[in-house]
Amino acid sequence: VPRSSSPDWAQCQQLSRNLCMLAWNAHAPAGHMNLLREEEDEETKNNVPRIQCEDGCDPQGLKDNSQFCLQRIRQGLAFYKHLLDSDIFKGEPALLPDSPMEQLHTSLLGLSQLLQPEDHPRETQQMPSLSSSQQWQRPLLRSKILRSLQAFLAIAARVFAHGAATLTEPLVPTA
């Protein structure tokens, strides 16, 4: 894969860091909670994109061909954007007007676009099928989705930090 298809790692690093902060602000867990608790068998139960060993997001995988990992991150961002667009976040109880959700949504879109090469066809992907949620379910669903997003973004940010540190092409000084 030619280097030209690589993203702007530094910009991705900055955006992903910002996204981590926004996701945290959108749902700072209560002190007693076991942070980012994920059950080992959860991934078999839902189609949530998770960054796993076989996705090539490790240092060697990124060096060999970063596109596999970037595709996985793109899928994850699209998946969560779809959830943030759903009635879980749009319906009652209404989110506070100063909620960071709008910023989070915009930044997810921004990072997705940064990772989507101009000539790259949009990937078709299994999106979560959400039956209409009841009002009492939404606060719980929001919490679970945002904590899952936090875990996803934390790994994505580490990938971009590594990419920015090791895969960014050095500037060639002009004569």
Partner: nanobody
Framework: EVQLVESGGGLVQAGGSLRLSCAAS????????MAWFRQAPGKEREFVAQ????????YYADSVKGRFTISGDNAKNTVYLQMNRLKPEDTAVYYC????????????????WGQGTQVTVSS
């Protein structure tokens, strides 16, 4: 394994009151939210009331709004359901449930359930 133990059920006349309690057996267990559900004979289990500890927000089914009050002690993982102006249609087995904070949202939102306590309202 955490057990949720309900108590306070019984037989009461229409218009009367009952207070249900539910406590987690493991004191180290921490929940994100706790709730009450009920199941009447031949019917599906239905949501009654919920408390989310962070922020203390509460939610009620329309059928119990203004009559039932959910409260609790987060530190003790104990939740209560004060039921006033009871009606015969409130007759059901009442279940306590707790959400431990898993991130899976495609399964049951609540991952711990009690055995239930019977509430019978006679007319």
């Amino acid at each position: 394994e955490v057990q949720l133990v309900e108590s306070g059920g019984g037989l009461v006349q229409a218009g009367g009151s009952l207070r249900l309690s539910c406590a987690a057996s493991d004191r180290t267990f921490s929940s994100y939210a706790m709730a009450w559900f009920r199941q009447a004979p031949g019917k599906e289990r239905e949501f009654v009331a919920q408390i989310i500890w962070s922020g203390g927000s509460t939610y009620y089914a329309d059928s119990v709004k203004g009559r039932f009050t959910i409260s609790g002690d987060n530190a003790k993982n104990t939740v209560y359901l004060q039921m006033n102006r009871l009606k015969p249609e409130d007759t059901a087995v009442y279940y306590c449930a707790a959400d431990s904070g898993r991130t899976d949202w495609t399964a049951d939102l609540y991952d711990y359930w009690g055995q239930g306590t019977q509430v019978t309202v006679s007319s």
